[in-house]
C-alpha cells in the first residue's frame, strides 16, 4: 500500500520510549452529520431482527445498539416462518474504550467487542444422524 507521509516530529513506534497511551478527544467531529436515513430493513428482511440498547457506563461509547434475530427460521413473502433456512446474526468486531481503572472519567483502555448489527438468512448446517 501507499504510506502517507509522516511528520518528522512524530515519535518512532519502534522506540522503547514510544507511549503506550494516547490522548483522545471524545468530542466527535461529525457527530451531527446525518448518517444514512434509518431504514426499515429490520422489518422487511426475510430474517427480521429487533434492535436492543446495550448500555454500559464504563464503556465509550456507553450505548451500542445490537440486533437480535426474531426467529430461528426465515420469513416468507406472506410473513410465515420457514425452517428450511435459518436466521443468523451478522457480527462485527469493533473497538471500544473501557474505563480503566473503573469509574475513572478520563482513563480508558482499548477493548475488542463483538456486536450483532443485523440478521441474514442462511442454509442450515446439515447434520447426518448415524
Amino acid at each position: 500500500g501507499i504510506a502517507s507521509p509522516q511528520n518528522p516530529g512524530c515519535p518512532n513506534a519502534e522506540d522503547k520510549n514510544f507511549p503506550r497511551t494516547v490522548m483522545v478527544n471524545l468530542n466527535i467531529r461529525n457527530r451531527n452529520t446525518n448518517s444514512k436515513r434509518a431504514s426499515d430493513y429490520y422489518n422487511r428482511s426475510s430474517s427480521p431482527w429487533n434492535l436492543h440498547r446495550n448500555e454500559d457506563p464504563e464503556r465509550y461509547p456507553s450505548v451500542i445498539w445490537e440486533a437480535k434475530c426474531r426467529h430461528l427460521g426465515c420469513v416468507d413473502a406472506d410473513g410465515n416462518v420457514d425452517y428450511h433456512m435459518n436466521s443468523v446474526p451478522i457480527q462485527q468486531e469493533i473497538l471500544v474504550l473501557r474505563r480503566e481503572p473503573r469509574h475513572c472519567t478520563n482513563s480508558f483502555r482499548l477493548e475488542k467487542m463483538l456486536v450483532s448489527v443485523g440478521c441474514t438468512c442462511v442454509t442450515p448446517i446439515v447434520r447426518h444422524v448415524a
Epitope: 429487533n50 436492543h52 446495550n54 445490537e66 437480535k68 434475530c69 426474531r70 426467529h71 430461528l72 427460521g73 410465515n80 416462518v81 420457514d82 425452517y83 428450511h84 435459518n86 436466521s87 443468523v88 446474526p89 463483538l114 450483532s116 442450515p124 448446517i125 447434520r127
Partner: antibody, heavy 120, light 108 residues
C-alpha cells in the same frame, strides 16, 4: 376456549410404536408453528420437535431424529407425533405447545400433557 | 451443543425479591423466555423476548438479559409463586430449542 388437548399416551414395550395426537381449539391453528416438548418423571423439560404452520418444514431434537415424525392436519386442527423404535429413555409426559407469533423463543400455550411409558 | 445453566434452587421470604439466573455463552445475543411450572401442572409462559410479559402475568414478574446471563426477577414474591422456573432459547447451530434444567423457587 383456547386450548390444546393431548391424547394417545400409554404403556408400550421398547422397540414398539405409538402415535400421539393434540387437538387444538379456540384459535387459528393453521397460522402457528407447533411443538412437542417432553418431561421425563422428575426431570427437566426437553424440546422434541417442531412443525411450521403449513407442515412443510420440520425440525427434530438429536435424541429423536430418525425415530419420531411430527405432522399436522390443519383441516382437523390437529397435531401428531408418530414415535417409532421407542426406548426406555423416551418415557415422559409429552406436551404439545404453540409457538408464539412474536418469535420462536416462546411457547405461549401448552396442553395438559399425556404420559408415555416405555417398559418391558 | 449450546447449554443453559440454572441454579437448582432459590429460596426467598414472602414479600422479598427473588432472582433466578440462566447462563449461556453470549446469551445476550439470543432471546430468552421463562416458564413457570407448578407440581402436576403444565408450564406457563411468564416472560418472552427477554423482558416482555404476556397478558395475565402479574407485573411482579420481570426479565432481563445481558452478557452471559438472563435473569427472571419476581418482586414482592408470594406463596403462589412457589414453582419450578425454566429458561429457554434457541440454538441456530443445532436448529433446536434449548431449555435450562429448571430452578425450584421456594417461598419460605
Amino acid at each position: 376456549q383456547v386450548q390444546l388437548v393431548e391424547s394417545g399416551g400409554g404403556v408400550v414395550q421398547p422397540g414398539r410404536s405409538l402415535r400421539l395426537s393434540c387437538a387444538a381449539s379456540g384459535f387459528a391453528f393453521g397460522s402457528y408453528t407447533m411443538h412437542w416438548v417432553r418431561q421425563a418423571p422428575g426431570k427437566c423439560l426437553e424440546w422434541v420437535t417442531l412443525i411450521s404452520f403449513d407442515g412443510r418444514s420440520k425440525l427434530y431434537g438429536d435424541s429423536v431424529k430418525g425415530r419420531f415424525t411430527i405432522s399436522r392436519d390443519n383441516s382437523k386442527n390437529s397435531l401428531y407425533l408418530q414415535m417409532n423404535s421407542l426406548r426406555a429413555e423416551d418415557t415422559a409426559v409429552y406436551y404439545c405447545a404453540r409457538g408464539s407469533v412474536r418469535g420462536e423463543a416462546a411457547f405461549d400455550l401448552w396442553g395438559q400433557g399425556t404420559l408415555v411409558t416405555v417398559s418391558s | 451443543s449450546y447449554e443453559l445453566t440454572q441454579p437448582p434452587s432459590v429460596s426467598v421470604s414472602p414479600g422479598q425479591t427473588a432472582s433466578i439466573t440462566c447462563s449461556g455463552d453470549n446469551l445476550r445475543t439470543k432471546y430468552v423466555s421463562w416458564y413457570q411450572q407448578k407440581p402436576g401442572q403444565s408450564p406457563v409462559l411468564v416472560i418472552y423476548q427477554d423482558t416482555r410479559r404476556p397478558s395475565g402475568i402479574p407485573e411482579r414478574f420481570s426479565g432481563s438479559n445481558s452478557g452471559n446471563t438472563a435473569t427472571l426477577t419476581i418482586s414482592g414474591t408470594q406463596a403462589m409463586d412457589e414453582a419450578d422456573y425454566y429458561c429457554m432459547t434457541w440454538d441456530v447451530d443445532t436448529t433446536s430449542m434449548i431449555f435450562g434444567c429448571g430452578t425450584k423457587l421456594t417461598v419460605l
